[in-house]
């Protein structure tokens, strides 16, 4: 999917996908403007599925995607939990 | 610091369930992207992972022996645990309790417990 | 399940030796590999992750490397402290799978 490491700018990403992360199994987005030491946007998806990717900040069906989430009302109801026990 | 350490029986029989637990500290399974994990290694073969459990309860566990694992934890205690049913003498192996931590970059099983050795044996 | 075919399964070799370990994967696994270093009577440890980025104080002469579905490790000269077992592990997806091993013994 990518590489990542700690390095010296500070950034979690060293690459990133494009390829698109389905809206239903994304459980948090972490949008990091520069700062810190880090002079690029990160984007950092956890996945339900128990995973954690680093994602192209300027891919387009990011950019649909971070609009849906932030029209979305903060008091809208939360998805039903997917099922708990997994043959993995 | 963060340690991790094994402890169930050192010998049981054929049939029986095999106990484990996980004692930890220098982490908690409460915050978002904490988890505990299981994998085992019989004498001088290859490693196994047997089952995962997350701060949210999220269980794993390897398809290839489901029927037979349950993992589970207490939060409040530090404590993660796997039961295995109905053990037969190719259950014997060292078992490790491991960490993973939801971060990116992602390295699961980044710490690892000392191991704690099981025999099956009639 | 994704397999991953480690070889060789053991192997001897001489203080100052380069030596490389592969791992094949039954399928695409983009990176996600671990490489980790089981010294005799301890607990494995990470040693390479995401296939190519040194662990927190793994020596400079440990690296990893991607060819398609190959991925290898690499000791670029041999010391004695790196006598162990060598483990690959794809966390792409459930169930993580390991390699079979590696020991690496002194010639």
């Known amino acids: 999917i990518l590489e990542a490491h700690y390095t010296n700018l500070k950034c979690r990403c060293s690459g990133v996908i494009s390829t698109v992360v389905g809206l239903n199994i994304i459980d948090r987005i972490q949008v990091t403007p520069p700062g810190n030491g880090c002079p690029k946007t990160e984007v950092v998806i956890w996945t339900k599925m128990k995973k954690v990717i680093c994602v192209n900040p300027r891919a387009k069906w990011l950019q649909r995607l971070l609009r849906h989430v932030q029209s979305k009302s903060l008091s809208s109801t939360p998805q039903a939990p997917v099922s708990k026990r997994r043959a993995a | 610091q963060v340690t991790l350490k094994e402890s169930g029986p050192e010998i049981l029989q054929p049939s029986q369930t095999l106990s484990l637990t996980c004692t930890f500290s220098?982490?908690?399974?409460?915050?978002?992207?904490?988890?505990v994990g299981w994998i085992r290694q019989p004498s001088g073969k290859g490693l196994e992972w047997l089952a995962n459990?997350?701060?949210?309860?999220?269980?794993y566990y390897n398809p290839s022996l489901i029927n037979r694992l349950t993992i589970s934890k207490d939060t409040s205690n530090n404590q993660a645990f796997l039961k295995i049913t109905n053990v037969d003498t190719t259950d014997s192996a060292t078992y490790y309790c491991?960490?993973?931590?939801?971060?990116?970059?992602?390295?699961?099983?980044?710490?690892w417990g000392q191991g704690v050795m099981v025999t099956v044996s009639s | 399940d994704i397999q991953m075919t480690q070889s060789p399964s053991s192997m001897s070799a001489s203080l100052g030796d380069r030596v490389t370990i592969t791992c094949q994967a039954s399928?695409?696994?983009?990176?996600?590999l671990i490489w980790f270093q089981q010294k005799p009577g301890k607990s494995p440890r990470p040693l390479i992750y995401?296939?190519?980025n040194l662990a927190n104080g793994v020596p400079s002469r440990f690296s990893g490397r991607r060819s398609e579905s190959n991925y290898s490790l690499t000791i670029s000269s041999l010391e004695s402290e790196d006598m162990a077992d060598y483990h690959c592990?794809?966390?792409?997806?459930?169930?993580?799978?390991f390699g079979a091993g590696t020991k690496l013994e002194l010639k």
């Open positions: 995401y296939a190519t």
């Open positions: 459990i997350w701060w949210d309860d999220d269980k």
């Open positions: 491991v960490r993973s931590e939801l971060v990116m970059p992602y390295v699961p099983f980044d710490y």
């Open positions: 592990l794809q966390f792409k997806q459930y169930p993580y799978t």
């Open positions: 220098g982490f908690s399974l409460s915050p978002y992207g904490m988890g």
């Open positions: 399928q695409d696994i983009e990176n996600d």
